[in-house]
């Protein structure tokens, strides 16, 4: 763009350097040349010579018109073609820009990411405005009623630290630009309502040589938070559709879960967990992919066996001691055999 | 109750340096969004940089690189180091809590005078 430019006169525009995307446009070039009286004055947009809709006002002053403007960003310069001279002389030279006014920040949420030591909100800023648009987060004390402002730009991290004060916060968005100015719904905040789990990972999965072999899925988590709700869902990795199993999960111990699935196919899973009662979830873990062994023998496939069944949802502990060359200490697994369902809405999908 | 008191301006050439001081109260500062604003003779109000919350800071077009925000949270004091001034930065400058846009930003002090003349 034209930063610093020395003018030999004067360049403005209607109805302003930053103007609404779509509306009409007047610029104007005036000559304060010495030495020269203009033959012509020309426009020149991003560069190029403009040919159409320039007026000549009068013997120092011309304007060119553009109906709708609608290009985010132009370069426009004017030059004075004098008499006697080969080159076009400088006028002066303006950064225009178009663009829309903010739409209200839309579908604001505060979590904590455990041990993370943040608060994040994020937001949908609406459709691109073009230009540049400051978004200020407001958060502000229930209980002090001082607040604090941060600037973002479609999101933001607040240190816990400065959350210290109270437990209890109003948040809101105000997005501000030249054109405009918007502020999205009020969110009301408890700190403690909206912590989410430390992130869960499936560590190993294994196939069973029983007669009807089942998969155990092994889990874990470091979150210190004692009721954590959780879903596992997995599928084919041919197929679209995710069957989930729903469960409370104790991360004291390693987490055991049981799955009885088609042989010989590979499977994807993936697990999410919540604090039991809240609203906020973790991002699905990453995919585990897991190839369960070849059916031995030949054995009528049972129906109930399929992931896709609905099963009866049930939690089962099992104890289980460790192999004769450790030190005998028992350690409780948790086990789960429970429904299946077709999952809907998820992101993260896999094949 | 909110208070801010600037201090610290006075004349100088042009290309000089300049450093305005903000002693604030009643209200916990170590956490608050603040803002410079100024006002030249004949003209409104203007802002020149703001700090937010968790220390981003933010300078108007005209004052970039040349002017420095920052906030001593011991001494409950907000700065403004003004470098390379120019004649056009004449004006009495105000400090005041919150950002400089979405009218969230108030001032209670008296401000302090600037004159950048040779």
């Known amino acids: 763009g034209i930063t610093s430019i020395n003018c030999s006169g004067d360049m403005w525009v209607e109805p302003g350097e930053i103007f609404q995307m779509g509306m009409n446009v007047s610029i104007y070039c005036q000559e304060a040349l010495k030495h020269c009286r203009p033959r012509n004055l020309y426009f020149y947009k991003n560069g190029f010579k403009e040919e159409f809709d320039i007026t000549r006002i009068n013997r120092t002053t011309a304007r060119i018109w553009y109906k709708g403007f609608s290009e985010p960003h132009a370069y426009m310069h004017c030059t004075a073609e004098c008499p006697g001279h080969f080159q076009e002389t400088l006028i002066c030279g303006k950064d225009i820009s178009s663009g829309h006014p903010p739409d209200a920040p839309s579908n604001l949420t505060c979590v904590i990411y455990e041990y993370s030591g943040n608060m994040t909100c994020t937001w949908n800023t609406g459709k691109p405005t073009y230009i540049d648009t400051k978004y200020i987060v407001h958060v502000k004390s229930l209980e002090t009623e001082e607040e604090q402002q941060y600037l973002a730009s479609s999101y933001v991290k607040i240190s816990t630290d400065s959350l210290q004060g109270s437990r209890k916060y109003l948040v809101w968005v105000q997005a501000v630009n030249s054109l405009g100015m918007e502020n999205s719904q009020q969110l009301h905040v408890h700190l403690d309502d909206i912590v989410i789990p430390s992130a869960s990972i499936i560590s190993r999965a294994e196939t069973t040589n029983d007669t009807v072999p089942k998969t155990i899925v092994y889990w874990k988590s470091k979150t210190m938070i004692e009721k954590v709700f959780c879903e596992m869902r997995y599928k084919t990795t041919t197929n679209q559709t995710w069957s989930v199993k729903e469960f409370d999960a104790n991360f004291t111990y390693v987490q055991q879960s049981e799955f009885y699935l088609e042989p010989d196919s590979k499977y994807v899973f993936q697990v999410r967990c919540q604090e039991t009662g809240k609203r906020n979830w973790q991002p699905w873990s990453s995919p585990f992919v897991h190839q369960t062994s070849q059916e031995t023998g030949k054995r009528n496939w049972q129906p109930w066996s399929s992931p896709f069944v609905h099963q009866t949802s049930q939690t089962v502990s099992q104890v289980t001691a460790k192999s004769s060359h450790e030190p005998q200490k028992m350690e409780m697994l948790s086990a789960t055999i429970f429904r299946g369902h077709p999952a809907s809405g998820n992101h993260q999908d896999i094949g | 109750q909110v208070q801010l008191q600037e201090s610290g301006g006075g004349l100088v050439q042009p290309g000089g340096s300049l450093r305005l001081s903000c002693a604030t109260s009643g209200f916990t500062f170590s956490s608050s969004a603040m803002t410079w604003v100024r006002q030249a003779p004949g003209k409104g109000l203007d802002w020149v940089s703001g700090?937010?919350?968790?220390?981003?800071?933010v300078y108007a077009d005209s004052v970039k690189g040349r002017f420095t925000i920052s906030k001593d949270n011991a001494k409950n004091t907000l700065y403004l180091q003004m470098n390379s001034l120019k004649t056009e930065d004449t004006a009495v400058y105000y400090c005041?809590?919150?950002?400089?846009?979405?009218?969230?930003?108030?001032?209670t002090g008296q401000g302090t005078q600037v004159t950048v003349s040779s």
């Open positions: 005041a809590t919150g950002l400089p846009w979405g009218n969230t930003w108030r001032t």
């Open positions: 700090i937010d919350s968790g220390g981003t800071t």
